[in-house]
Structure formats: structure tokens, C-alpha cells
């Protein structure tokens, strides 16, 4: 059978395009350095394709290699303010399951007010992503200054 | 039929491979911030499989999710320049139709002298991606130091 | 006969995925400015799946167009460090065969430590990919700070 | 195809000045971003001062407040006026389409005493 027709015949999860891109929802309360997520079309441009929020965390529903990205820019941001409340520090890992708990993306912002990067790394089912902004500097909640995201690359 | 031989028997553009990498080709007249891109084997290491160019902005032919990247260096610059010429920003966006006009990424240089970024977004057949740079510093015609594409990920 | 069996049925590398990820292992000696990558499971979260290392430099088993990303951070660094020790630039290329020779990505860090990007563009087999670090300030060797991977997007 | 041609090169004393012409061959030049480089033998070319087809102007940092670019659209021409010349400014200064990778020839300057 013709894979163009096999491609339609067969939901799109089952070829293992899992895919999600998030913009922020929140931060957390004091002392929880995390960033709270949130998707979905109604939002804007966010979505999310196999993977799962879990109170604002990233789930991942299926083993595999993962590209996972992420930009975060300052929300009242110069490079002196930047210097000024340094170290300011974005790290992305693995939070739970405990066993699994790792850091997989750091970036500090020196001087400046935007991070950008991404990894490829092995994820397995269950693992739920943590992005950790720690400092005393706030993130833009504008979706095209701060998003996160992870795309499922092979298994 | 195995998918090796039938991946062989169909052309890549019906499996939604569609892939843009491209160089800088000049910056806009003046009140035009958008920068104005080529792409093609005989130009050096850019290609256009599927998007085309219309006017040296990125059109698309494909429905999807698609990876967006850009990295964009300053010509003639240093922490100093750029600093001196805040603010610099560069912003990628869909410009047309306008009714689908939106921002999709925004990054600025406050004291550095390169952005880098990528994300995901769904993008539609028709659709025109726009790079305006505002402020008056000029960028980077190197091929290794301004760059921009964009890769279909899923439908 | 369906995709997802078919998919089960074929070795991956005959579709194609071949992708990589590698960790710092360390710097070349005096005169010699390329950055030693090592990959595996054993190691962490770095692996190989088609690609090779060769003397620690990454070497391409299949033609086609490839996702290229690295992030590298400096070891002892604020923004003043980085900037009293400008410049200090990273460029990744093929530098080998010498007949394909060519710079494909190239950033300074200017005043900050940490310079992260990725491009798309085509490899053939037998490219060997070099990443020169050049100026006086060393990287540091932690897998979420400087990484250095490759992922095969399409023929 | 434009083509450059630079002239106004020579030998000057520390603290002298110089203005270097362009003349470009093609009606786009209009057109076009233009850019002065220099190149000191055994080393890379250096972007000095860059000029779009509006008049917006940029700098390297060591030329700022020397050196000058400025263009005459109806003759065809950009000038780079340089000012509080020292030793190290002695090299093969180039004019170029900037965003074309159009180069001319070059012209030598020379600063000692």
C-alpha cells in the first residue's frame, strides 16, 4: 500500500509525531522556581500533539529522541537591569519521576534579556519537563518572547 | 510494500518534507525593515524544497507545523555599537495574508551582536514570513552569520 | 501493510534518522582551536545513531539535509570576563574533506557566555564536522551547558 | 553588473587626513548598501563604514568619529573622509557593494612620517 495513503488512513499519533509548543501561563508562588505552561488553540499558536500538561509541566507520553527548545525573555528588561539582578538563570529537566531527575538546558542572561536554545535528548513516558527560572527578574508572558516546546525526532 | 521501496517510489514533496534554508540577500529601503532573502545551490548552502520566494520573502506551499529559525549578526558591531544603537529588534512574523498577520518570534540585541532563535508554529499554504529588523544597525551578509529557515515537522 | 508495522519491520537507519548528540569531552592542545566531542549512553544523555566520531570531531554516514545545533558556554565567566577577553568566537564547518571545507555557523559571545544556535544544511557522507573555539576563555564541560548534536531532516 | 573603482590613496603624515572615492559604473547604484573596507597584508579585511541607499550610516568602533562615509547618489560616487590618520591605519582600503559581494580593486594608504 502507497505510504501517502497508509499516512491518511492512520492517526498521526501512531507514527510517533508527538509535538507541543507551549507559551507561559504563570509563575509559580515563592520559593517554586518553576514556570507554569499552558496550550491550546484557543490560546493563540500554541498546541499540543501527544503530550500532556500536568498542573503547567510538560508530561511526555511516548519513548523517544526529543528536540526540546525553549526561549524566555525578561518582561522589564535592559542590559543593565539584567546585569544589575545577575545571575539570572533558565535551566529545562527532567523533574519527575525522581529517578529520573536531571538537568538537561542551562542558560544564564548576563547581560542580556533573552534566552534561546535547544538539545536533543532521549525522553521516555512519564518524564515530566521543569523549567526553572531562578533570580529575581520576571518572564514576558508575550507569546512570540516566550515560548517552550519539544518535538519528537525518532525513537 | 515496505516503506524503504514505497519512500523511493514517491516523490519527498507528497511525504510533507517541505525545507527552507536562506541567505541574506539585501536589507529593505528605508521605512521597509524587512529584510530580503535568496535561496539555491548556485548561491552557496541555501535551498528551497517545497517554499518559495516572493519578492525575497518566504512563502508557504504546505499546511503544517513547521520549525522556524533564524539567526541574524550584526555587520559592524561590538557590546559597544550595539548598546549605543538600542534598541535593535528583530521580529519574524506571518505578513500575509493580513488577515493572518501575527508576530511569531521577537528577540533583541541589547548588548550582543547576534540573535539566535527557533520555534514551532503552525503555518498555512499562502502564508508569507517576514524578518523586519528595526533600528539602525545593518546585518551580517556572511552566510554563516545570517541565516533563516524553516522545516515541515507534521500536518 | 500498514505503516506502523512496516516501521517496526525496517532497521530505523533505513529511514533515514540518523541523529546525534555529544558532550564535550576536551580541547584540542596549543594551535589546535577545535572543541573533542564524546557520545554514547555511558556518558550520559549524548548518543550516536548513524553518525561517527572520529579523533572526537563528528563524521556523516548519510547524504542529506541535516539540523545542525550547539551550545557552548565559557567555564569561569561573567559578561565583564567575556568582554575583557574579547573576542571569543565559536564556527562550526566541515573540515574535512578539505575539497568541502566551509564555515556553516559562526557567533561571538561578545559580553556573554553562552552562545546557542542551529541551522539547517545538507551533508554528505564522509563530511566531517569541526567546532573551533577561538580566543583565550575555556568551555565548560557540563552536558546541560555545551552540547553539540546533528539530526537528519530529509534526503 | 556595477563596477567599483576607488582612487584618492597615497602616502600622509600622522594626524593628516585623506578622502577616498568610489565610482560606481551602474544606474542601481542607487540602490544599493555601500561599504569601505581595508586589508593589512597577512591579515583579514576589516568592514570599516557601511552607507545604505538612504544615507543611514554604521561604524566600526576604532573608526568612529574619524572616519566618514558619505555617498552622491547623482554622480555615482561614495566618499570615506579620514580624519586624525595614525601608523596603523596604513592598508588597502576597498570599496564594495556590500550585500552584491562587489568588489574594486582597491587603493593603497600609507601613514608615516
Known amino acids: 500500500q502507497r505510504f501517502a495513503q497508509a499516512q491518511q488512513q492512520l492517526p498521526l499519533e501512531s507514527l510517533g509525531w508527538d509535538v507541543a509548543e507551549l507559551q507561559l501561563n504563570h509563575t509559580g508562588p515563592q520559593q517554586d522556581p518553576r514556570l507554569y505552561w499552558q496550550g491550546g488553540p484557543a490560546l493563540g499558536r500554541s498546541f499540543l500533539h501527544g503530550p500532556e500538561l500536568d498542573k503547567g509541566q510538560l508530561r511526555i507520553h511516548r519513548d523517544g529522541i526529543y528536540m526540546v527548545h525553549i526561549q524566555v525573555t525578561l518582561a522589564i528588561c535592559s542590559s543593565t537591569t539584567a546585569s544589575r539582578h545577575h545571575p539570572t538563570t533558565l535551566a529545562v529537566g527532567i523533574c519527575s519521576p525522581a529517578s529520573r531527575s536531571i538537568s538537561l538546558l542551562r542558560l544564564s542572561f548576563h547581560q542580556g534579556c533573552t534566552i534561546a536554545s535547544q538539545r536533543l535528548t532521549p525522553l521516555a513516558r512519564g518524564d515530566t519537563l521543569c523549567t526553572n527560572l531562578t533570580g529575581t527578574l520576571l518572564p514576558s508572558r508575550n507569546t512570540d518572547e516566550t515560548f517552550f516546546g519539544v518535538q519528537w525526532v525518532r525513537p | 510494500q515496505r516503506f524503504a521501496q514505497a519512500q523511493q517510489q514517491l516523490p519527498l514533496e507528497s511525504l510533507g518534507w517541505d525545507v527552507a534554508e536562506l541567505q541574506l540577500n539585501h536589507t529593505g529601503p528605508q521605512q521597509d525593515p524587512r529584510l530580503y532573502w535568496q535561496g539555491g545551490p548556485a548561491l552557496g548552502r541555501s535551498f528551497l524544497h517545497g517554499p518559495e520566494l516572493d519578492k525575497g520573502q518566504l512563502r508557504i506551499h504546505r499546511d503544517g507545523i513547521y520549525m522556524v529559525h533564524i539567526q541574524v549578526t550584526l555587520a559592524i558591531c561590538s557590546s559597544t555599537t550595539a548598546s549605543r544603537h538600542h534598541p535593535t529588534t528583530l521580529a519574524v512574523g506571518i505578513c500575509s495574508p493580513a488577515s493572518r498577520s501575527i508576530s511569531l518570534l521577537r528577540l533583541s540585541f541589547h548588548q550582543g551582536c547576534t540573535i539566535a532563535s527557533q520555534r514551532l508554529t503552525p503555518l498555512a499554504r499562502g502564508d508569507t514570513l517576514c524578518t523586519n529588523l528595526t533600528g539602525t544597525l545593518l546585518p551580517s551578509r556572511n552566510t554563516d552569520e545570517t541565516f533563516f529557515g524553516v522545516q515541515w515537522v507534521r500536518p | 501493510q500498514r505503516f506502523a508495522q512496516a516501521q517496526q519491520q525496517l532497521p530505523l537507519e533505513s529511514l533515514g534518522w540518523d541523529v546525534a548528540e555529544l558532550q564535550l569531552n576536551h580541547t584540542g592542545p596549543q594551535q589546535d582551536p577545535r572543541l573533542y566531542w564524546q557520545g554514547g549512553p555511558a556518558l550520559g544523555r549524548s548518543f550516536l545513531h548513524g553518525p561517527e566520531l572520529d579523533k572526537g570531531q563528528l563524521r556523516i554516514h548519510r547524504d542529506g539535509i541535516y539540523m545542525v545545533h550547539i551550545q557552548v558556554t565559557l567555564a569561569i565567566c561573567s559578561s565583564t570576563t567575556a568582554s575583557r577577553h574579547h573576542p571569543t568566537t565559536l564556527a562550526v564547518g566541515i573540515c574535512s574533506p578539505a575539497s568541502r571545507s566551509i564555515s556553516l555557523l559562526r557567533l561571538s559571545f561578545h559580553q556573554g557566555c553562552t552562545i546557542a544556535s542551529q541551522r539547517l544544511t545538507p551533508l554528505a557522507r564522509g563530511d566531517t564536522l569541526c567546532t573551533n573555539l577561538t580566543g583565550t576563555l575555556l568551555p565548560s564541560r557540563n552536558t546541560d551547558e555545551t552540547f553539540f548534536g546533528v539530526q537528519w531532516v530529509r534526503p | 553588473q556595477l563596477q567599483l573603482v576607488e582612487s584618492g590613496g597615497g602616502l600622509v603624515q600622522p594626524g593628516g587626513s585623506l578622502r577616498l572615492s568610489c565610482a560606481a559604473s551602474a544606474g542601481t547604484f542607487r540602490f544599493k548598501t555601500m561599504g569601505w573596507h581595508r586589508q593589512v597584508q597577512g591579515k583579514q579585511r576589516e568592514l570599516l563604514a557601511l552607507?545604505?541607499?538612504?544615507?543611514?550610516?554604521n561604524y566600526a568602533d576604532f573608526v568612529e568619529g574619524r572616519f566618514t562615509i558619505s555617498r552622491d547618489n547623482a554622480k555615482n560616487l561614495v566618499y570615506l573622509q579620514m580624519n586624525s590618520l595614525k601608523p596603523e591605519d596604513t592598508a588597502v582600503y576597498y570599496c564594495?557593494?556590500?550585500?552584491?559581494?562587489?568588489w574594486g580593486q582597491g587603493t593603497q594608504v600609507t601613514v608615516s612620517s
Open positions: 552607507i545604505t541607499s538612504g544615507g543611514s550610516t
Open positions: 564594495n557593494a556590500y550585500y552584491d559581494d562587489i
